[in-house]
């Protein structure tokens, strides 16, 4: 272990402690305006007042006091578009990744009192205002309800809802986690006339059941319809209701494109284009074909028509359609043409402009980099993010394309703003992008700023993390490097976190942190003070993160390399990187470890069992151990089906259990929460069984009643303390 460099008293900086990390001492703040118009926004202040801001008049005032919030223990709020009412959210109770239930109260801003009569039932699964006025749509017990006004009795739109069977307006488990990435599955039309929603029928889906121990004499069983690879999937239908006359025509079903409906399929997203035009995206179960379908309301028929000539097909010949998800369209003002990110002929994801057919799409961006997200399309500008600048895949800058100009001109809005501090941005735009907020995540301290949408001038600093900056002044932070290494024809970007007094002539233990899942990215130019920062700062460990094949934003050749063969190249590339790091001369070959969580737990397990002798020890937290145990939408996207005539062989070959014998010469710590709804405890149970059967010694820790995040304060403290002890023991570092 490198000896500490002596520093005179006057300049003493301390190393990070594990306690600092567990207490969140050095966490940062971001500032996202809650836009309510072109130039107005709301923000919840530190003391929980809801404050109204007008950028142009510079006025600000409290629209909802913290005492009103506190009177119902509210933790969130939502202003109705007519500004007459606010919903207050309390009793937040987390369900899965995005979903939660809550109690809602409606506060009348005009009268300064809560709306009495026809109070909302509790707990509600989802609630939202219409985009105009103050209609309310909410989901209660898997059914959708509509209120024309907050004080009105509700109209029940659906009656089919049944716990764990039929979900209306909210996704089931697999759609929430793997397709929509939201807690809701209903969308208001821009004028609030129509409400589109999805019905998910899980009646035929197999159930995952696990024990929740709680405090009772008997554990209770959690049952979730959860389709694993190859299992029966949810049956989805999309309906649209006229909210003015919901009781007249009833829900109108939107037809599924023929080429999609001919076999198992998914609904992937819905985008309202105008008050009477909607765009639905569908995906075949074999996820290489996506269809975007534009549908119009025909007043004369009183129906939604989706003409074949308004179907746009997106197909991948080298892998799956889209990135992690299929991208969504950003429609122009004409409500016909749209901008969309998909792979160009060279396999890089770029913005295309579609006017009539995908075949005639005009490519808007191009190069050996990728467009990542379209934020906003206005009359004359398109704002998007990409990793183009200076060729670093792990950066994000915001660009503006002036689409009014011919040819369109491109400007990087963020590239040179705070170049050292800020290389990874996101943005939040007011309604027509008259103003926007930029949120910079690093590599320096995060900072949020407000900008003029016409000139891009900075108007105001919203949050600059001054307190954090001050408290970090006396901390010895590690040095972070982002570089690339080459192996054969491949380039791998890596992030290295070096101990504060790093000396290239000395030897250091190395910890590889891996995720490595398809379309993920670990090497990002973001600020973080976390467990690995502590390990470098205090324990003198070199940390490395490597983006191998299968990771995102470097083109389809790199991304699709893992298609139908998960668990091969992701592992191989981590091993390649470790060998390259050893060649750098400052790594102690006898003290190399690897750790990962979730997909990273799978990769770390396979790397430990690679038989290379590179690793002394490693940790897998909540690992996938077989793709047959994981969700259909995810597993099949990258692996196909676990059937004999498809890809069963590789499903079997790529399990951790198949490599049990190879764990004999490494120290392995296996960790899992028993109430993991996502990567089921089953995965670790099967690894443990295989290791026992192979008579291989290993260490294990379970966290009772903890889910995939092992998030409870006590569990997290225990987890990181436990992993720290394990690593220090492995690296022979004294306590």
């Amino acid at each position: 272990r490198p000896s500490r460099v002596y520093k005179p008293e006057g300049n003493t900086k301390r190393a990070l402690t594990l306690k600092d990390i567990l207490n969140g001492t050095f966490s940062y703040k971001t500032y996202f305006p809650n836009w309510i118009s072109e130039q107005e926004y709301l923000h919840q202040s530190e003391d929980d007042n809801i404050v109204f801001y007008n950028i142009e008049t510079r006025e600000s005032y409290i629209i909802l006091s913290n005492s009103t919030m506190k009177s119902v223990n509210a933790t969130d709020y939502g202003l109705s578009p007519d500004r007459q009412f606010v919903y207050l959210e309390s009793d937040y109770s987390k369900l899965w990744r995005y979903s939660y239930t809550a109690t809602y109260y409606i506060y009348d801003l005009q009268n300064g009192e809560f709306v009495r009569g026809y109070e909302l039932p509790r707990p509600i699964q989802y609630l939202c205002w219409s985009p105009v006025g103050s209609k309310l749509a909410y989901v209660y017990q898997n059914n959708i309800y509509l209120k024309q006004r907050p004080g009105d009795p509700p109209f029940q739109i659906t009656y089919t809802g049944r716990e764990n069977r039929i979900f209306n307006g909210i996704p089931d488990w697999v759609y929430e986690e793997e397709m929509l990435a939201t807690k809701y599955a209903l969308w208001w039309s821009p004028d609030g006339k129509f409400l589109a929603y999805v019905e998910f029928n899980d009646s035929d889906i197999p159930i995952i059941a696990y024990s929740y121990y709680g405090d009772g004499q008997y554990p209770r069983t959690i049952n979730i319809p959860y389709p694993k690879a190859g299992a029966k999937n949810p049956v989805v239908r999309v309906f649209i209701v006229d909210t003015t006359y919901p009781h007249h025509v009833g829900p109108m079903e939107v037809p599924v494109p023929e080429m999609i409906a001919s076999s198992d399929y998914y609904f992937s997203w819905l985008t309202w284009v105008s008050s009477e035009r909607v765009c639905l995206q569908w995906l075949k179960r074999v996820q290489n074909v996506s269809v975007l379908s534009i549908c119009d309301f025909r007043e004369d028929w009183h129906a939604w028509e989706c003409p074949k000539n308004q179907e746009h097909v997106e197909e991948s010949r080298t892998g799956w359609a889209g990135g992690f998800f299929v991208s969504t369209p950003a429609f122009s003002q004409d409500a016909t043409s749209y901008y969309k990110i998909f792979s160009d002929k060279d396999g890089y994801k770029h913005i295309h402009y579609i006017k009539d057919t995908v075949e005639n799409a005009i490519q808007i961006t191009s190069g050996k980099w990728e467009a990542i997200y379209i934020f906003r399309v206005t009359q004359d500008s398109l704002f998007y993010s990409s990793n183009e600048f200076e060729g670093y895949p792990g950066r994000r800058n915001i660009y503006r394309i002036s689409i009014g100009n011919s040819p369109p001109s491109k400007k990087c809005v963020t590239c040179h703003l705070r170049k050292e501090r800020c290389q990874y941005y996101t943005a939040s735009f007011s309604y027509k992008a008259k103003y926007y907020a930029l949120v910079c995540y690093g590599p320096g301290l995060p900072i949020s700023t407000l900008h003029d949408g016409r000139t891009d001038q900075e108007i105001q600093v919203l949050e600059e993390n001054k307190e954090l900056e001050n408290s970090l002044r006396n901390i010895q932070l590690p040095k972070v490097e982002i570089k690339k290494l080459k192996d054969g024809g491949l380039t791998f970007w890596y992030k290295m976190i070096l101990p504060p007094q790093f000396d290239r002539s000395k030897k250091y233990p190395l910890l590889i942190q891996v995720y490595g899942g398809p379309c993920s990215q670990s090497v990002k130019s973001v600020f973080a003070v976390n467990w690995i920062t502590y390990l470098a700062s205090k324990e003198g460990i070199v940390i490395a993160l490597v983006d191998g094949r299968g990771t995102a934003f470097q083109g389809d050749k790199f991304l699709h390399a893992v298609y139908r063969k998960l668990g091969v190249y992701e592992v191989e590339d981590q091993l390649t990187a470790v060998r390259k790091f050893i060649e750098m001369g400052f790594i102690d070959e006898e003290r190399i470890a690897i750790w990962g969580w979730s997909y990273g737990g799978y990769v770390s397990s396979l790397a430990l069992a690679s038989g290379t002798g590179l690793f002394k020890c490693g940790i897998a937290v909540a690992p996938v151990s077989s793709w047959e145990y994981y969700a259909s939408i995810y597993s099949e996207r990258f692996m196909g089906l676990p059937t004999k005539d498809d890809n069963l062989e590789h499903y079997k070959n790529s399990t951790v259990m198949a490599r049990a014998e190879y764990f004999r010469n490494v120290d392995y710590l296996l960790i899992h929460g028993t109430a993991d709804d996502n990567v089921h405890f089953q995965n670790s149970a099967q690894i443990a069984k295989a290791l026992v059967n192979a008579q291989v010694d290993f260490q294990a820790m379970w966290y009772s009643d903890q889910n995939h995040g092992i998030l409870s304060g006590r569990s997290q403290n225990h987890l990181y303390t436990h992993m720290t002890h394990f690593l220090k023991q492995c690296f022979s570092l004294s306590d």
Epitope: Y159, G250, P251, E253
Partner: antibody
Framework: EVQLLESGGGLVQPGGSLRLSCAAS????????MSWVRQAPGKGLEWVSG????????YYADSVKGRFTISRDNSKNTLYLQMNSLRAEDTAVYYC??????????WGQGTLVTVSS | EIVLTQSPGTLSLSPGERATLSCRAS???????LAWYQQKPGQAPRLLIN???RRATGIPDRFSGSGSGTDFTLTISRLEPEDFAVYYC?????????FGQGTKVEIK
């Protein structure tokens, strides 16, 4: 002009079955929810069942649930009500009406169903 | 289910008079979801008043609907000979849709 024409009514013994039809014309049938409403002799109106335009959602009054089935054939512009296990209290004039839970703006002339031994 | 109670059961009036028919709901319905129908002997019902107390197509303006919450009224400002019939209110806010028992408007 919107027209709804019911047929299939008649005399049936308790426990028997009957299938009512309603032929629709003058509007885009497949786009609209349709309902069956009945009226026992000398009594008021009672909603029996409803079906949305695509046929994908159906609802029933508790009094007929499990015995009656509403369906539609949009290619034939026809609404159906399959009535099984008929009881004396099902005796009524059965109307087909254009609408879902309300706003029944067009009605057929009705067909009489008599359940008697 | 929501029970609709109509009163009076029978209303005896002369042509030209004003008729006021009442409909009370067991729970709030709001005018958005309350409709009124007219039925003459041997005929199918006919929609009179629809969403938000609006007259249905082709209904003369002597018919008007009002009310909110649980209390609703159908008013016929000047009875014409063809208006003598049975009138039903109906709620469509909740399954099952229900009808009132009817008010018979007869010639005095």
């Amino acid at each position: 002009e919107v027209q709804l024409l019911e047929s299939g009514g008649g005399l049936v013994q308790p426990g028997g079955s009957l299938r009512l039809s309603c032929a629709a014309s003058g509007f885009t049938f497949s786009s609209y929810a349709m309902s069956w409403v009945r009226q026992a002799p000398g009594k008021g109106l009672e909603w029996v069942s409803g079906i949305i335009g695509s046929g994908g959602i159906t609802y029933y009054a508790d009094s007929v649930k499990g015995r009656f089935t509403i369906s539609r054939d949009n290619s034939k512009n026809t609404l159906y009500l399959q009535m099984n296990s008929l009881r004396a209290e099902d005796t009524a004039v059965y109307y087909c009406a254009k609408g879902w839970f309300g706003g029944f703006n067009y009605w057929g002339q009705g067909t009489l169903v008599t359940v008697s031994s | 289910e929501i029970v609709l109670t109509q009163s009076p059961g029978t209303l005896s009036l002369s042509p030209g008079e004003r008729a006021t028919l009442s409909c009370r709901a067991s729970q709030s319905v709001t005018s958005s979801y309350l409709a009124w129908y007219q039925q003459k002997p041997g005929q199918a019902p006919r929609l009179l008043i629809n969403v938000g107390s609006r007259r249905a197509t082709g209904i003369p303006d002597r018919f008007s609907g009002s009310g909110s919450g649980t209390d609703f009224t159908l008013t016929i400002s000047r009875l014409e000979p063809e208006d003598f019939a049975v009138y039903y209110c109906q709620q469509g806010i909740m399954l099952p849709p229900t009808f009132g028992q009817g008010t018979k408007v007869e010639i005095k």
